[in-house]
Amino acid sequence: QKPHKRKTQLKAAGCCEEMRELKAQVANLSSLLGELSRKQESDWVSVVMQVMELESSSKHMESRLSTAESKYSEMNNQIDIMQLQAAQTVTQTSADAIYDCSSLYQKNYRISGVYKLPPDEFLGSPELEVFCDMETSGGGWTIIQRRKSGLVSFYQDWRQYKQGFGSIRGDFWLGNEHIHRLTRQPSRLRVELEDWEGNARYAEYSYFALGNELNSYRLFLGNYSGNVGKDALLYHNNTVFSTKDKDNDNCLDKCAQLRKGGYWYNCCTDSNLNGVYYRLGEHRKHMDGISWYGWHGANYSLKRVEMKIRPEAFKP
């Protein structure tokens, strides 16, 4: 999900004059955020209103998009930094701990995008950058995996899958250690899938948890619901994680090497959501693609996948 506040805002990067004006508005907004944090206010609504105003004031610049390319990333970075700083500031000044995107949602952070979760000294967990989906099915989802561009290889080793890899705004794996920590409270899993024909489906699980590293990040799943047809994670339930350098599967063949990913390989797959990203034209030819057996065949590689979690007890 793209952050709503950026739909037109990030397009607006016209000539230098207007750019400076917009940067000034950004600076004003930053200063407003600083003031909010100093007063230890947790109300994000006013900030959202400012952002909406900023959006509308930038709309007149959309005709100049042809010259905006070079300045796009700079604006993108500034606004992301603001959003991260906003999240960070509130979590530091709030009496209630922030564990995940659902915690942020309950504190009125309602815009999908990148946030920083603060370190938890008690649990010994570091600061964590996450992408929050605050819109889908009530919001509050922490995204743990995304495949959409094919720019990141998912044929990674155990260490990479443990700590996470990729780009939080693009294709990424959040990291087994982080996912294990996040799912120590009872959680739900939502898997969203899109094929190359533009069809979208989802699968939801009433319970989702990963064991710790000593237990090789074993997968625990609850009941399935959704519209994808077949529960293609059931075959992987209660299996441990395997990578190209750690063959933990239940197979005489090394599934991680055959399926080119890291996953809860059994022997081998009903789904392979961390497989190879094959583009249109190649997407029907390989057994090691991003597959979900039952919706499409074992050799159909999907266009887009997102895996996201939130606490079972979450109330929108």
Epitope: Y235, D247, C251, R259, D270, Y293, G297
Partner: antibody, heavy 125, light 107 residues
Framework: EVQLVESGGGLVQPGGSLRLSCAAS????????MSWVRQAPGKGLEWVSA????????YYADSVKGRFTISRDNSKNTLYLQMNSLRAEDTAVYYC??????????????????WGKGTTVTVSS | DIQMTQSPSSVSASVGDRVTITCRAS??????LAWYQQKPGKAPKLLIY???SLQSGVPSRFSGSGSGTDFTLTISSLQPEDFATYYC?????????FGQGTKVDIK
């Protein structure tokens, strides 16, 4: 014709060691997983161990784990079972078997499609 | 470990009879089941793999069915050469395990 011929069986004292061999012919040995299965006198079949085609993956029955080692030499088309710390209950006919693999959707199905005639191991003092 | 339980442990039948042997797994094994035939003093012979696929060269009077925990081997019309002991075996997870065997003998 696919053939498996076991050798190396015999009489050994408890606590002793023995190495079984299985010579394979008639197929591309390195492409197939292999397995050992045993049968005690008058008893049923008991799976002992299996090894992948490359030799990189090995599996054992709990009853032999830590005492038996399965290995293979693909250049010699030979499968081995090194048996240490032998016990009376290891007395059996030992069969080597070729493991065939079939894939249905994304799943691999294994089954032992060709068996040797067996070699007898007797552990007794 | 997955336990495999066969029933009956023995069956007496006549040539031409239909014989059914069942095998139950202690937990779901999908279709990861094979059936073997063994005659006295001989090595086992594969009959059925993946629960219902007939191995090449095996007569069509042998058939397998089932999925999950309950499986069946059926001999539609028993022939003299079919008197033997039959074993089921799961390959769903290691360690692979066999049933205790079902002996089919002459009535």
């Amino acid at each position: 014709e696919v053939q498996l011929v076991e050798s190396g069986g015999g009489l050994v004292q408890p606590g002793g060691s023995l190495r079984l061999s299985c010579a394979a012919s008639g197929f591309t040995f390195s492409s197939y997983a292999m397995s050992w299965v045993r049968q005690a006198p008058g008893k049923g079949l008991e799976w002992v161990s299996a090894i992948s085609g490359s030799g990189g993956s090995t599996y054992y029955a709990d009853s032999v784990k830590g005492r038996f080692t399965i290995s293979r030499d693909n250049s010699k088309n030979t499968l081995y079972l090194q048996m240490n710390s032998l016990r009376a209950e290891d007395t059996a006919v030992y069969y080597c078997a070729k493991v065939e693999r079939d894939m249905v959707r994304g799943h691999y199905y294994y089954y032992m499609d060709v068996w040797g005639k067996g070699t007898t191991v007797t552990v007794s003092s | 470990d997955i336990q495999m339980t066969q029933s009956p442990s023995s069956v007496s039948a006549s040539v031409g009879d239909r014989v059914t042997i069942t095998c139950r797994a202690s937990q779901g094994i999908s279709s990861w089941l094979a059936w073997y035939q063994q005659k006295p003093g001989k090595a086992p012979k594969l009959l059925i793999y993946a629960a219902s696929s007939l191995q090449s060269g095996v007569p069509s009077r042998f058939s397998g069915s089932g999925s999950g925990t309950d499986f069946t081997l059926t001999i539609s019309s028993l022939q003299p050469e079919d008197f033997a002991t039959y074993y089921c075996q799961q390959a769903n997870s290691f360690p692979w395990t066999f049933g205790q065997g079902t002996k089919v003998d002459i009535k």
